[in-house]
């Protein structure tokens, strides 16, 4: 069993190294920014909206293209729930330093958890996406 788990870990590791998770990161960041642009998630901002809508984000075409490419990448992890979780954790880790607000971080996590389902894939049952609040600057 240990040998099998070790092989599984190695297989997952090489899958993660091969995968291009950038389209997933681009899709998620566009999605949460589009939601914020639409609804103004900062209730304390004078105009109820910290930012004004951007035509680039409103178009949505770029985001659906990213989503399609993202789903293709996540499909590689369909048969390994633990590895799917590690892929989601990697996405969270890669973007955490871009999210300098509690709501932004929570919304990103919510969207990230829903991602496998959006792609028609099984979502991992237990997957801890916690990172240090505000993220660390990674260059």
């Amino acid at each position: 069993r240990q040998q099998w788990e070790l092989q599984g870990d190695r297989r997952c590791q090489s899958q993660l190294e091969r995968a291009n998770l950038r389209p997933c990161e681009q899709h998620l960041m566009q999605k949460i920014q589009r939601d914020e642009d639409s609804y103004g998630r900062d209730p304390y901002s004078p105009s109820q909206d910290p930012y004004s809508p951007s035509p680039y984000d409103r178009r949505g075409a770029g985001s659906s293209q990213h989503q399609e490419r993202c789903c293709n990448e996540l499909n590689e992890f369909e048969n390994n729930q633990r590895c799917m979780c590690e892929a989601l954790q990697q996405i969270m880790e890669n973007q955490s330093d871009r999210l300098q607000g509690r709501q932004q971080e929570q919304q990103f996590k919510r969207e990230l958890r829903n991602l496998p389902q959006q792609c028609g894939l099984r979502a991992p049952q237990r997957c801890d996406l916690e990172v240090e609040s505000g993220g660390r600057d990674r260059y």
Epitope: R22, E25, Q26, L28, M29, Q30, Q33, E36, D42, P43, Y44, S45, P50, Y51, S54, Y56, H66, N94, Q95, R98, L99, Q100, G101, R102, Q103, Q104, E132, S133, G134, G135, R136, D137, Y139
Partner: antibody, heavy 118, light 111 residues
Framework: QVQLVESGGGVVQPGRSLRLSCAAS????????MHWVRRSPDKGLEWVAA????????YYADSVKGRFTISRDSSKNTLFLQMDSLRVEDTAVYYC???????????WGQGTLVTVSS | EIVLTQSPLSLPVTPGEPASISCRSS???????????LDWYLQKPGQSPQLLIY???KRASGVPDRFSGSGSGTDFTLKISRVEAEDVGVYYC????????FGQGTKVEIK
């Protein structure tokens, strides 16, 4: 109404210390990264330090690393900047600013003047 | 450390005329998520700075549409389509890819 009010500025000799405060009201202070930025006539705007909403992560400009310490008191909605070993080149107006959540500086205080002079 | 270089450092303008400021970065400001982490701020005389443009091209709330930002990677531009008297002040670009740093500022004044 959004308000960030800095205090604690003044005239101080080189090598001495000063502690700046920034009292926040009308904004979700505890939900966002907070920053200190300074403006001097010769250097313009210079980002100084930032602290994540949970206070776990702290970031500093190279020019102040090891001398300045940023902290926050969530119960009092207050941001602090402890400035030690002050130098003449630290003379500036110091502003506190709240992050937008996406690394932009969205809300700014009116600033407090720090003068380091012998 | 990322260095931002603005030009020109001083810009005399005529009300009603267009104006543009350039900001060049010592390295690309595109994050792996596809966004350019470059903002523009204006500090009017006697006031605190204010956010104009974030992520290179998105206009902040309440900012007049005569202001626009463009560019990607290392070269960015802030354009004012028709300058108004109230637009005078010092304009700064700021990168937020690696911690945060400002350009040296461009002073815009009426001719």
């Amino acid at each position: 109404q959004v308000q960030l009010v800095e205090s604690g500025g003044g005239v101080v000799q080189p090598g001495r210390s000063l502690r700046l405060s920034c009292a926040a009201s009308g904004i979700a202070f505890n939900d966002y990264t907070m920053h200190w930025v300074r403006r001097s006539p010769d250097k313009g705007l210079e980002w100084v330090a930032a602290i994540s909403y949970g206070g776990t992560n702290k970031y500093y400009a190279d020019s102040v690393k090891g001398r300045f310490t940023i902290s926050r008191d969530s119960s009092k909605n207050t941001l602090f900047l402890q400035m030690d070993s002050l130098r003449v080149e630290d003379t500036a107006v110091y502003y506190c600013a709240r992050d937008s959540g996406y690394r932009s500086l969205l809300h700014w205080g009116q600033g407090t003047l720090v003068t380091v002079s012998s | 450390e990322i260095v931002l270089t603005q030009s020109p450092l001083s810009l005399p303008v005529t009300p009603g005329e267009p104006a543009s400021i350039s900001c060049r970065s010592s390295q690309s400001l595109v994050h792996r998520n596809g966004y350019n982490y470059l903002d523009w701020y204006l500090q009017k005389p006697g006031q605190s700075p204010q956010l104009l443009i974030y992520m290179a091209s998105k206009r902040a709330s309440g900012v007049p549409d005569r202001f626009s930002g463009s560019g990607s990677g290392t070269d960015f531009t802030l354009k004012i389509s028709r300058v108004e008297a109230e637009d005078v002040g010092v304009y700064y670009c700021m990168q937020a890819l690696q911690t945060w740093t400002f350009g040296q500022g461009t002073k815009v004044e009426i001719k």
